[in-house]
Interface confidence: medium
Amino acid sequence: GATAGTIDTKRNISAEEGGSVILQCHFSSDTAEVTQVDWKQQDQLLAIYSVDLGWHVASVFSDRVVPGPSLGLTFQSLTMNDTGEYFCTYHTYPGGIYKGRIFLKVQESSDDRNGLAQFQTAPLG
């Protein structure tokens, strides 16, 4: 039969605009070994890790996505447009394919929020 395995993720994470965030999926299995990990933003490829060939980051993200830590990704210089679903796909042998989902919410930076509040309240003072 198929070898059982599980993927654990933080289902919802948040980060500030301009900041960075770590996207991480944790795969656990007694016997199955990871052969490849794919990371996608919706259906857009972010990066691939292959046990044999190492990391490759897609061209469109190559200036903002750094492999690691472990089999995760560090996503830098975040914009509001980066808000959305991210998927990790673990290809394992002999266990098959396992998928995890993370929802990333990119928020206005605290500096921007504070600045906006001060601007709005200043005329009332």
């Epitope: 996608k40 259906d43 691939i48």
Partner: antibody, heavy 116, light 106 residues
Framework: QVQLMESGPGLVQPSQTLSLTCTVS????????VHWVRQPPGKGLEWIGA???????DYNSALKSRLNINRDSSKSQVFLKMNSLQTEDTAIYFC??????????WGQGVMVTVSS | DIQMTQSPSLLSASVGDRVTLNCIAS??????LAWYQLKLGEAPKLLIY???SLQAGIPSRFSGSGSGTDFALTISGLQPEDVATYFC????????FGAGTKLELK
């Protein structure tokens, strides 16, 4: 065996759109990535863009605004469209396959000249 | 973008020579490097991937070495059919090529 063949017009007018077709055999487009790479006369190679096995695309950021890559998997064809061509787009255009991020099989290329 | 610098741009050698072509990356690309052979009017050929893995069907006189930022392609015993232009390519982040080394016979 794996084969790729590029086809399209040899001459394109400035400001017009280039349309190229890559016809592949020996592998399914739903399992492998196909890229476009070009070589201007006397210069090096430049990666243009790719369509992944999933159908998602990845473009050279410097060319992205002028590019569209799509495919017809049932016909084993990948299409490149590049608009607003200028003389500096004159090059040999190659399509190439990757199972990973290096290019293991290439077509012979098609020479495209941008001139009025 | 990761920049790739190849040297020399032109190399003249004799049949039987051991020749070395160099490629330097602008940042650490680990072993994510490939070498290609280009001849006019022919399909380019993958020689080496993952810095030192020989592609199937490529003669064993071709070998690759290096990791991080410094890489080399060595041809041990140059043959007339090796006259071509050679390009390195990184695939760590996106895809970029070196400017090429043209190899000719003395």
């Amino acid at each position: 065996q794996v084969q790729l063949m590029e086809s399209g017009p040899g001459l394109v007018q400035p400001s017009q759109t280039l349309s190229l077709t890559c016809t592949v055999s020996g592998f399914p487009l739903t399992s492998y990535t196909v890229h476009w790479v070009r070589q201007p006369p006397g210069k090096g190679l430049e990666w243009i863009g790719a369509i992944w096995s999933s159908g998602s695309t990845d473009y050279n950021s410097a060319l992205k605004s002028r590019l569209n890559i799509n495919r017809d998997s049932s016909k084993s064809q990948v299409f490149l469209k590049m608009n607003s061509l200028q003389t500096e787009d004159t090059a040999i255009y190659f399509c190439t396959k990757s199972g990973w991020a290096f290019f293991d099989y290439w077509g012979q290329g098609v020479m495209v000249t941008v001139s009025s | 973008d990761i920049q790739m610098t190849q040297s020399p741009s032109l190399l003249s050698a004799s049949v039987g020579d051991r020749v070395t072509l160099n490629c330097i990356a602008s940042q650490n690309i680990y072993k994510s490097l490939a070498w290609y052979q280009l001849k006019l009017g022919e399909a380019p050929k993958l020689l080496i991937y993952n810095a030192n893995s020989l592609q199937a069907g490529i003669p064993s006189r071709f070998s690759g070495s290096g990791s991080g930022t410094d890489f080399a392609l060595t041809i041990s015993g140059l043959q007339p059919e090796d006259v071509a232009t050679y390009f390195c390519q990184q695939y760590s982040g996106g895809y970029t090529f070196g400017a090429g080394t043209k190899l000719e016979l003395k």
